[in-house]
């Protein structure tokens, strides 16, 4: 690489193909998949990255509800269909003509159905809870310190207000984020909590999706955070609409 | 050191068609974006155009679509500008300028007098 | 396309004074705006990119703020080689447009 083509890359999102062929010699860069370009100043749309990645391994996983109403992503991943903001479409197909119902981080919200199957909306996830076990340590990391590099982390290298990261509660063990963002609390240009909890998760399992930088390194008053396993759960603004017997398997 | 060399001035007859250079040294030709820009005496300046030797990609100022042509060959690290239809308002200098996001280079210019 | 309007079109300056000249898009440009300074029988020189960013050999008493639609270049205080014509360039969007100028001239 050159130190111009070195420049040209976009430090949010590694999975994006740059050139300065933008106006006046500006660093454009568009990601993998999609075409789409986008703002490498902010996190990237998870509905892009997920279209990036879609050829990577299948990775789904079975997980325990807190609610009723939460959503947890069993389904793993697919190839969705983004608007032309980047955000998940309401409805998605695969290209057997299945389809079904997301909400906006591109959770199934619906059994699935057939092309008739009609999805009035993107409806909006408004609360994410992301559960996390950590590996043992000499003794239990202090609450208050936890919490304040969770949000350290949150608000800087995810770019989320700290008004968004609601509570961060620790039983050793055990350590729970709780991200909230109704749809009038968020304003233009603030990241989505979506966003920033799935580039949370690529983090975790080493996949980073920033360019060039290290791997996350979370320390606690210079303790290492090993997290050993994590389980994101998904509260929409108007509860997922599921059969009967999906309710009761 | 970044440098852009213009081919010397032109005197041409109306309706005639001029082709000027602008050899590029010091960086990767493949690299950078060059722009022209124009010049009229006593005028301030106006974009023509954007060419990127990298993927041959190009962008026009509409008022230029049909007058102003832009190449660029990468084996002699030089970019092209060719104006067709020449009169009396194509008269100018021509300036070309590697550009990266926003940080310009230029050369020296290239006048165009455009007479009977 | 973007409209840059440019003022002063042209002014006059003592040697020491603090010069502004301003440029307003016609609409947000988020920051990418560049000023050149042209002087007769020579090439464009770049001064300032990205609104505010100083071009290397450029001398520190010039300087480039603002944001959206408002971006001003200011000389804290004129020397005799600044005199010239002075044009801000926003490349936003293409097609790329250049103010209508700033002559700059001693008193």
């Known amino acids: 690489h050159t130190a111009a083509q070195d420049n040209c890359t976009c430090p949010t999102n590694k999975m994006t193909v740059c050139s300065p062929d933008g106006p006046g010699g500006r660093c454009q860069c568009r990601a993998l998949g999609s075409g789409m370009a986008v703002d490498c100043s902010t996190l990237t749309s998870k509905c892009l990255l997920l279209k990036a990645r879609m050829s990577a391994p299948k990775n789904a996983r079975t997980l325990v509800r807190p609610s009723e109403h939460a959503l947890v992503d069993n389904d793993g991943l697919y190839d969705p269909d983004c608007d032309p903001e980047g955000r998940f479409k309401a409805r998605q197909c695969n290209q057997t003509s299945v389809c079904w119902c997301v909400n906006s981080v591109g959770v199934r919200r619906t059994d699935k159905g057939d092309l008739s199957l009609r999805c009035d909306e993107l409806v909006r996830t408004h609360h994410i809870l992301i559960d996390l076990r950590h590996r043992p340590t000499a003794g239990a990391f202090n609450h208050s310190d936890l919490d304040a590099e969770l949000r350290r982390l949150f608000r800087e290298r995810y770019r989320l207000h700290p008004k968004f990261v609601a509570a961060v509660h620790y039983e050793q063990p055990t350590i729970q984020i709780e991200l909230r963002q109704n749809t009038s609390q968020k304003a233009a240009g603030d990241v989505d909590i979506g966003d920033a909890a799935y580039y949370f998760e690529r983090d975790i399992k080493g996949e980073s999706l920033f360019q060039g930088r290290g791997g996350l390194d979370l320390r606690v008053r210079g303790e290492p955070l090993q997290v050993e396993r994590t389980l994101i759960y998904y509260l929409d603004e108007i509860p997922p609409k599921f059969s009967m017997k999906r309710l009761t398997a | 050191q970044v440098q852009l060399q213009q081919s010397g001035p032109e005197v041409v007859k109306p309706g005639a068609s001029v082709k000027m250079s602008c050899k590029a040294s010091?960086?990767?030709?493949?690299?950078?974006?060059i722009n022209w820009v124009k010049q009229r005496t006593g005028q301030g300046l106006e974009w023509i155009g954007q060419i990127y030797p990298g993927s041959d990609s190009f962008h026009y100022n509409k008022n230029f679509k049909g007058k102003a042509t832009l190449t660029a060959d990468k084996s002699s690290n030089t970019a092209y500008m060719q104006l067709n239809s020449l009169t009396s308002e194509d008269s100018a200098v021509y300036f070309c300028?590697?550009?990266?996001?926003?940080?310009?280079?230029w050369g020296q210019g290239t006048l165009v007098t455009v007479s009977a | 396309d973007i409209k840059m309007t440019q003022s002063p079109s042209s002014m006059y300056a003592f040697l020491g004074e603090r010069v502004t000249i301003t440029c307003t898009a016609s609409?947000?440009?988020?920051?990418?705006l560049s000023w050149f300074q042209l002087k007769p029988g020579k090439s464009p020189k770049s001064l300032i990119y990205r609104a505010n960013r100083l071009v290397d050999g450029v001398p520190s008493r010039f300087s480039g703020s603002g944001s959206g639609q408002d971006y001003s270049l200011t000389i804290s205080s004129l020397d005799y080689e600044d005199m010239g014509i002075y044009y801000c360039l926003q490349y936003d969007e293409f097609p790329l447009t250049f103010g209508g100028g700033t002559k700059l001239e001693l008193k």
């Open positions: 010091g960086y990767r030709f493949t690299d950078y974006v």
């Open positions: 609409q947000g440009i988020n920051n990418y």
């Open positions: 300028a590697r550009f990266f996001e926003g940080l310009a280079y």
